[in-house]
């Protein structure tokens, strides 16, 4: 977590400022969608448990060509210790359940929103 | 319209058990934690225990754990707070109240209360 | 446990009058997540509290401007610039910080 700020960040970023701007810019996610976020892309639903960065990261990281999503990326790798590619899937996965890219940012802003509140970064 | 209405207060004995009910409406309870305080007689507030619908988070102040359990119903969109063993110092109305959906930063909304009396 | 002690226990003010609430948490409530979660709770018998003030010093949507908080680390301060005839009430002070949470033992704002 030391280095999600970046280049343009003097320092490490504390863990609470890093889960505050990934809420914040899924925030901004469901509050500029207008047409179908990803074009109504499908991915794989988590379970939202210990080790779900690495595995939200490895849903959305299918998701090519969509430009709404990409700094989520960049910014869930940086609470995911291990490299993420495309098609790599963890037990974190609901292997029979997929859902639009829309829901799958909603359901993980409501989780890590709470997460923030109960003081829990990791 | 966002709406808390509590429920199932009354007259209970000494070492009695009761449930009180608190239904949502005007939003979903997985989207944010509920609580229930009380408020004794002539006396101040109270806070005694909180849920997160979405995964049964559950937190009580310590006094109350062991004797109160809190739940809820996702289906009915509705919360519960079961009392066993009352006393008579449990008397008060109970509240529920949600916190705010956007951070979970304070208390926006609140019932009009439920009265429990503990007495033989 | 936080306690969280208000003063004065009651005041008698006329309407106009500057009212100042104080709170005193026995311990920090500064959050891990940075935020201080101390808010303003004003209640009228027979009533629900309504909130008036969120993380020290937020007016809550609604709160008429005379209403404002301030404060740090483990004292903070309810303000009435100019109390109105619907401000008497019993106002209390609440730390969502830490578990279990606390309200402070309130404070009766009484017509001299």
């Known amino acids: 977590l030391t280095c999600l700020g970046g280049f343009a960040s003097p320092g490490p970023v504390p863990p609470s400022t890093a889960l505050r701007e990934l809420i914040e810019e899924l925030v901004n996610i469901t509050q500029n969608q207008k047409a179908p976020l990803c074009n109504g892309s499908m991915v794989w639903s988590i379970n939202l448990t210990a080790g779900m960065y690495c595995a939200a990261l490895e849903s959305l990281i299918n998701v090519s060509g969509c430009s709404a999503i990409e700094k989520t990326q960049r910014m869930l790798s940086g609470f995911c210790p291990h490299k993420v590619s495309a098609g790599q899937f963890s037990s974190l996965h609901v292997r029979d359940t997929k859902i639009e890219v829309a829901q799958f940012v909603k359901d993980l802003l409501l989780h890590l929103k709470k997460l923030f509140r109960e003081g829990q970064f990791n | 319209e966002v709406q808390l209405v509590e429920s199932g207060g009354g007259l209970v004995q000494p070492g009695g058990s009761l449930r009180l009910s608190c239904a949502a409406s005007?939003?979903?309870?997985?989207?944010?934690?509920i609580h229930w305080v009380r408020q004794a007689p002539g006396k101040g507030l109270e806070w005694v225990a909180r849920?997160?619908?979405?995964?049964?988070?559950?937190k009580y102040d310590p006094k109350f754990q062991g004797r109160f359990t809190i739940s809820a119903d996702n289906a009915k969109n509705s919360l519960y707070l079961q009392m066993n063993s009352l006393r008579a110092e449990d008397t008060a109305v109970y509240y529920c109240?949600?916190?705010?959906?956007?951070?979970?930063?304070?208390?926006?909304?609140w019932g009009q209360g439920t009265l429990v009396t503990v007495s033989s | 446990d936080i306690q969280m002690t208000q003063s004065p226990s009651s005041l008698s003010a006329s309407v106009g009058d500057r009212v100042t609430i104080t709170c005193r948490s026995s311990?920090?409530?500064?959050?891990?997540?940075?935020?201080?979660?101390l808010e303003w709770y004003q209640q009228k018998p027979g009533k629900a509290p309504k909130l008036l003030i969120y993380?020290?010093?937020n007016r809550f949507s609604g709160v008429p401007s005379r209403f404002s908080g301030s404060g740090s680390g483990t004292d903070f301060t309810l303000t009435i610039s100019s109390l109105q005839p619907e401000d008497f009430a019993t106002y209390y002070c609440?730390?969502?910080?830490?578990?279990?949470?606390?309200f402070g033992g309130g404070t009766k704002v009484e017509i001299k």
């Open positions: 109240a949600r916190s705010e959906e956007n951070w979970y930063d304070f208390f926006d909304y």
């Open positions: 005007g939003f979903n309870i997985k989207d944010t934690y």
């Open positions: 849920i997160d619908p979405a995964n049964d988070n559950i």
């Open positions: 311990q920090s409530i500064v959050h891990s997540n940075g935020n201080t979660y």
């Open positions: 993380k020290v010093s």
């Open positions: 609440f730390q969502g910080s830490h578990i279990p949470y606390t």
